[in-house]
Interface confidence: medium
């Protein structure tokens, strides 16, 4: 069966300077390939976090994704700023051998509202 990506929260509100968790789980780790978080859609979408080992300032994974059968790809964004406002998507990719990774499934999106402190 096709992998399913779920973001249960439609929206989260966070005060500037605080941290927030964006939840995402998948039903399967197959096909092999990374999970990435983006803000926005289409041409303007911005890579926020990738579960592939790179360093992303202010963003950490919530659970230990090195553990076998971990299906939780939630992230924590710390020291939130007004520029962090927007809709975040958790996206599953299938790894390409020579060609680029292929996007196969996206969560429904979670809108982040940033409140003035």
């Amino acid at each position: 069966t096709e992998v399913k990506v779920t973001q249960p929260e439609k929206s989260v509100s966070v005060a500037a300077g605080d941290s927030t968790i964006l939840n995402c789980t998948v039903t399967s780790l197959l096909p092999v390939g990374p999970i990435r978080w983006y803000r926005g859609v289409g041409q303007s979408r911005l890579l926020i976090y990738s579960f592939t080992g790179e360093h992303f300032p202010r963003i950490r994974n919530v659970s230990d994704t090195t553990k076998r059968n971990n299906m939780d790809f939630s992230i924590r964004i710390s020291n939130v700023t007004p520029e962090d406002a927007g809709t975040y998507y958790c996206v599953k990719f299938q790894r390409g051998s020579s060609e680029p990774d292929t996007e196969i499934q996206s969560g429904g999106g979670t809108e982040v509202y940033v409140l003035a402190k």
């Epitope: 779920t6 249960p8 929260e9 439609k10 929206s11 989260v12 789980t25 039903t27 429904g108």
Partner: antibody, heavy 119, light 108 residues
Framework: EVQLVESGGGVVQPGRSLRLSCAAS????????VNWVRQAPGKGLEWVSL????????YYADSVKGRFTISRDNSKNTLYLQMNSLRAEDTAVYYC????????????WGQGTLVTVSS | EIVLTQSPGTLSLSPGERATLTCRAS??????LAWYQQKPGQAPRLLIY???SRATGIPDRFSGSGSGTEFTLTISSLQSEDFAVYYC??????????FGGGTKVEIK
């Protein structure tokens, strides 16, 4: 105080159409996703359809897909359900239900309107 | 689609007794589960969300517990106004949103 008032129910023959309305008040209608949920006589609750606050995101239950159309007019604070090709199994009380602003559970419900499909 | 199974179908109890209602999910819904109460001729009313948080105005004799696939709604001491049908609903999965089949709590 949140109020949701459904109207438009009645008796209709199989294959015919009906349009339900839900008038909302007491909250900023355009900021909330709203749903139709139905209940056949003596049966449980069945989710029918959902529309986002802006109207851009729409979902339907498989049982009504292609026959029912959900819409909203935020300038009139009103939710609609256009029901075509009605069947006997569509007979139910239809409730409009306002979602929580963060999760897809239902904070507030209307009193319901009865749709009876019968020849 | 996530299937919710409620048990028992009917619970016959006397006022003052404790009621324990169960809702099982076909796959994990974490704590994304709500409970509603419905009385005859009325719309459902939200009781519990997040598996254990009481909605505004709900008396503390109502409590929810559980996570994953097994959930419980407990009414510690039944009052006359508590005899009704109770439904669980998961909101973890993207639509279709699903409800359990309901448990009727009736006077013994």
């Amino acid at each position: 105080e949140v109020q949701l008032v459904e109207s438009g129910g009645g008796v209709v023959q199989p294959g015919r159409s009906l349009r339900l309305s839900c008038a909302a008040s007491g909250f900023t209608f355009s900021s909330y996703d709203v749903n139709w949920v139905r209940q056949a006589p003596g049966k449980g609750l069945e989710w029918v359809s959902l529309i986002s606050g802006s109207g851009e995101i729409i979902y339907y239950a498989d049982s009504v897909k292609g026959r029912f159309t959900i819409s909203r007019d935020n300038s009139k604070n009103t939710l609609y359900l256009q029901m075509n090709s009605l069947r006997a199994e569509d007979t139910a009380v239809y409730y409009c239900a306002k979602e929580n602003n963060r999760y897809r559970f239902f904070d507030d419900w209307g009193q319901g309107t009865l749709v009876t499909v019968s020849s | 689609e996530i299937v919710l199974t409620q048990s028992p179908g009917t619970l016959s109890l006397s006022p003052g007794e404790r009621a324990t209602l169960t809702c099982r999910a076909s796959q994990s819904v974490y704590t994304y589960l709500a409970w509603y109460q419905q009385k005859p001729g009325q719309a459902p009313r939200l009781l519990i969300y997040g598996a254990s948080s009481r909605a505004t105005g709900i008396p503390d004799r109502f409590s929810g517990s559980g996570s994953g696939t097994e959930f419980t709604l407990t009414i510690s001491s039944l009052q006359s106004e508590d005899f009704a049908v109770y439904y669980c609903q998961q909101y973890y999965d993207r639509p279709p949103l699903t409800f359990g089949g309901g448990t009727k709590v009736e006077i013994k």
